[in-house]
């Protein structure tokens, strides 16, 4: 806490300007009117205040707005935003995308800080859903943002917002997240033609069920191995050798290099060896010829 002391004669600040950097902490506290600071917040970012001086300015705003800052002040916080705690930010009601962008700009190029995470959470909850414009903005600043959300949070993403998602935005998503996003993507891109559809849906295929992979295998999509390796193992296992060959097209040769890794390894174990031999890749580990394969899961379902 800064002690309350009278402002020395002639030092009362009439505006927020660079002369204030020469003020001691107690002088800033005594001589800068909080209401003046609030109306001229945009000037703070052009003045080389020390970290200590910024603490005083924040203290003045906290006293003026104990229930939380108004959006008109928040929008112009600039680097003073980085002096805010998550507890401070939870008091805010940020509704404007412009305000969100202005504050994200302050932390641009750096990992998401606790302040930013709290700000985004407040903003999204205030909007009720993650609309396209918000998602556009958030993924532009934080490509991994989408994958930081829980499956429950992702369920509030409307299919229309999926158009804003770029492949790199999904790099760190796990299967549970893709399970939620894939149906939304399928819905969002449903009116596109075959090749265009595949380009858009490709990044989301880690959440695709077997029947959709079978359908894609009929469309000459030539899926690359990197995408194939991210598919759900349980979705890949029921695919036949012929279906995988059609799905991968010329990329099928890459299976050999991945034969010890999931899902390829598990898929090989489910195929007849003579079917695997038709690929001519030397894949080993399939079911030997003459063996009978019982699908016990099917048997249990029938009983």
């Amino acid at each position: 806490e800064v002690e309350k002391t009278a402002c020395p004669s002639g030092k009362k600040a009439r505006e927020i300007d660079e002369s204030l950097i020469f003020y001691k902490k107690w002088e800033l506290e005594a001589c800068v009117d909080a209401a003046l600071l609030a109306t001229q917040m945009d000037r703070v970012n052009a003045i080389p205040f020390t970290y200590e001086q910024l603490d005083v300015l924040k203290h003045k705003l906290d006293e003026l707005y104990p229930q939380g800052y108004p959006e008109s002040v928040i929008q112009h916080l600039g680097y003073l935003f980085l002096k805010m705690s998550p507890e401070d930010i939870r008091k805010w009601n940020v509704t404007s995308l412009e305000t969100l962008k202005a504050l994200l700009e302050v932390n641009k190029g750096h990992e998401m800080s606790p302040q930013v995470a709290t700000l985004i959470d407040r903003f999204v909850k205030g909007r009720g859903q993650l609309d396209k414009d918000t998602l556009d903005t958030l993924t532009a600043f934080y490509p991994g943002y989408l994958c930081s959300l829980s499956p429950e949070e992702l369920s509030s993403v409307p299919p229309s917002s999926i158009w804003a998602v770029r492949p790199q935005d999904l790099d760190t998503c796990d299967p549970r997240q893709l399970d939620v996003l894939y149906p939304k993507a399928r819905l969002a891109f449903q009116n596109m033609n075959g090749s265009e559809y595949f380009v858009k849906i490709q990044s989301f295929l880690g959440g695709a069920p077997t029947e959709d992979l079978k359908a894609l295998s009929q469309q000459n999509v030539s899926m690359d191995l990197a995408t194939f390796m991210k598919l759900r193992t349980d979705a890949v296992l029921p695919l036949t050798v012929a279906e995988v060959q059609k799905l991968l097209g010329p990329h099928v040769e890459g299976l050999k290099a991945e034969e010890r890794h999931r899902p390829v390894r598990d898929w090989i174990l489910r195929q007849r060896q003579d079917d695997l031999d038709t690929l001519g890749l030397g894949l080993q580990g399939g079911i030997p010829n003459g063996y009978l394969v019982l699908d016990l899961s099917m048997q249990e379902a029938l009983s």
């Epitope: 052009a46 003045i47 080389p48 205040f49 020390t50 970290y51 200590e52 001086q53 910024l54 603490d55 680097y79 980085l82 002096k83 705690s85 641009k108 190029g109 750096h110 800080s113």
Partner: antibody, heavy 119, light 107 residues
């Protein structure tokens, strides 16, 4: 007068860890941000990391993100750099330097400590 | 990150010469630019901050100018003590990037 003294440098094998320290005196340590800057032999200066006065914000160069951690103990007037998964390209003289605000330059520097990463 | 490009990388000059070093930023940094001098085996020393403000104790033969993306450091009357490497650095963002350095050597 302001004094910054680095320590903790030495020879370390690739993949290993090292912790550097910077002891500060002659100013109110808890008021200012502290930076690490490095200089590979015969090369230019490379900013590594900064930690704000109250440790509320930490920023790193892309080249060290996820491997290096900057921290401080204001009660001991000491800055630290924990360096993990060291690589040959981390070989450098490491300097600590002070800045007084987000829009302030690095006005005081230590003399540096040499870190050599070699097998 | 903001990239800083210095030119020339090496400069040969004589005592008494007027020397100019240029620094270019990949995006506008307003006037948040510093110049440092470094001698072999020593730590860098702050010369100029905010593009043109002279640090306390630095001789007035050193001057800086520029704003936005183009900046210059000028040494008006080169002295024997000035032969060193000079670096520019932006501090408009928290990743405080340096230029690659300009070595001023004796002609």
């Amino acid at each position: 007068q302001v004094q910054l003294v680095e320590s903790g440098g030495g020879v370390v094998q690739p993949g290993r860890s090292l912790r550097l320290s910077c002891a500060a005196s002659g100013f109110t340590f808890s008021s200012d941000a502290m930076n690490w800057v490095r200089q590979a032999p015969g090369k230019g200066l490379e900013w590594v990391a900064v930690i704000w006065n109250d440790a509320s914000n930490k920023y790193y160069a892309d080249s060290v993100k996820g491997r290096f951690t900057i921290s401080r103990d204001n009660s001991k007037n000491t800055l630290y750099l924990q360096m993990n998964s060291l690589r040959a390209e981390d070989t450098a003289v490491y300097y600590c330097a002070r800045d007084r605000g987000p829009l302030w330059p690095l006005d005081y520097w230590g003399q540096g400590t040499l870190v050599t990463v070699s097998s | 990150d903001i990239q800083m490009t210095q030119s020339p990388s090496t400069l040969s000059a004589s005592v008494g010469d007027r020397v100019t070093i240029t620094c270019r930023a990949s995006q506008s940094i307003s006037r948040w630019l510093a110049w440092y001098q470094q001698k072999p085996g020593k730590a860098p020393k702050l010369l100029i901050y905010k593009a043109s403000s002279l640090e306390s104790g630095v001789p007035s033969r050193f001057s800086g100018s520029g704003s936005g993306t183009e900046f210059t450091l000028t040494i008006s009357n080169l002295q024997p003590d000035d032969f060193a490497t000079f670096y520019c650095q932006q501090y408009n963002s928290y990743s405080r990037t340096f230029g690659q350095g300009t070595k001023v050597e004796i002609k």
